[in-house]
């Protein structure tokens, strides 16, 4: 049985050119994460395996970065990236847990953070 | 460099068994999922199973469910295939393939032949 | 499972023509989709994983694209050492499984 939940940074919102950090958290389970994967809508962008360590897709080499943690960090972001992400927990026994981020990337210099959810 | 050699292929009768093996070289065993394809004379390619590198976790072809057995020796960088209750649709060249991060099949071995005929 | 239609099943082309063969998936991968090419004889050979990446090695003429359901192998300039079969593979889910293969033949 998935007891487990996935906590997320939710919806968030950051300047055209600058950085953002994702993140998503598993709790109230005892289940090994072996690996987490980060999609874009259809695009595979990272990888951290809990034995091979992270792969970054060679397309975003540039702009994404392993870390903090499981978490992946976006930079030089364009309007472009606005979407949503996902983040997949690959888990022994339990199975695959995912959460679901929006992002939103704004011209202007206001951008405010969303508050945090969660996903079961 | 990344080795990968199978052993154990050859004729066996039907209902019969046999187990290939496939010694992995050049990398850290351990570290990758490892997979079993499969691929009958002048036909495609079909995944047969994988096992995690832990060995914990392992999943099946319904073709084969309960009849094969996936497993592995990280001491001895050598994955195993237990082929029980053999049919004559299991005749192929059996492949041994490194999966990292469980994506890909990046390097595969040259394939050893498994002959179910009476 | 997820089935894995690829099209054409052979092809007749020459030294230097633009090959372009197809993946279709019967459900949304995202872009877990591979590229082998496999000669008579031999094992086959990583291409394109993750739908659009070059493994190490690749020549550059090899390029993938293509998320979802829909996928596609582009040989830019087809050499003679490109003749041969390649095969799709989906890695979203357990079982694994490939297409059908498309054999490249010389015209």
């Known amino acids: 049985m998935m007891t487990g939940t996935i906590e997320t940074t939710g919806n968030i919102s950051a300047e055209k050119g600058g950085s953002i950090i994702l993140q998503c958290h598993l709790s109230s389970t005892t289940a090994q994460v072996t690996q987490v994967n980060w999609e874009q809508q259809d695009q595979l962008l990272a990888i951290c395996n809990a034995d091979l360590g992270w792969h970054i897709s060679p397309s975003f080499k540039d702009r994404v970065a392993p870390g903090p943690g499981l978490g992946l960090t976006l930079q030089s972001l364009t309007v472009n990236d606005t979407g949503e992400y996902f983040c997949i927990y690959h888990t022994y026994p339990d199975g695959t847990y995912t959460g679901r981020i929006f992002l939103e990337v704004l011209e202007s210099s206001v951008a405010e953070h969303g508050a945090r959810f969660q996903i079961p | 460099e990344v080795q990968l050699l199978e052993s154990g292929g050859g004729l066996v009768q039907p209902g019969g068994s046999l187990r290939l093996s496939c010694a992995a070289s050049?990398?850290?065993?351990?570290?990758?999922?490892m997979n079993w394809v499969r691929q009958a004379p002048g036909k495609g390619l079909e995944w047969v199973a994988s096992i995690k590198s832990s060995s914990s976790y392992t999943s099946y072809a319904d073709s084969v469910k309960g009849r094969f057995t996936i497993s592995r020796d990280n001491s001895k960088n050598t994955l195993y295939l237990q082929m029980n209750s053999l049919r004559a649709e299991d005749t192929a060249v059996y492949y041994c393939?490194?999966?990292?991060?469980?994506?890909?099949?990046?390097?595969w071995g040259q394939g050893t032949l498994v002959t179910v005929s009476s | 499972d997820i089935q894995m239609t690829q099209s054409p099943s052979s092809l007749s082309a020459s030294v230097g023509d633009r090959v372009t063969i197809t993946c279709r998936a019967s459900?949304?991968?995202?872009?877990?989709l591979n590229w082998y090419q496999q000669k008579p004889g031999k094992a086959p050979k990583l291409l394109i994983y993750?739908?659009?990446s070059l493994q190490s090695g690749v020549p550059s003429r090899f390029s993938g694209s293509g998320s979802g359901t829909d996928f596609t192998l582009t040989i830019s300039s087809l050499q003679p050492e490109d003749f041969a079969t390649y095969y799709c593979?989906?890695?979203?889910?357990?079982?694994?499984?490939f297409g059908g293969g498309t054999k490249v033949e010389i015209k």
């Open positions: 050049g990398f850290t065993f351990s570290s990758y999922s």
């Open positions: 993750a739908a659009s």
């Open positions: 593979q989906q890695s979203y889910s357990t079982p694994l499984t």
């Open positions: 393939a490194r999966g990292p991060y469980d994506t890909w099949l990046d390097y």
């Open positions: 459900q949304s991968i995202s872009s877990y």
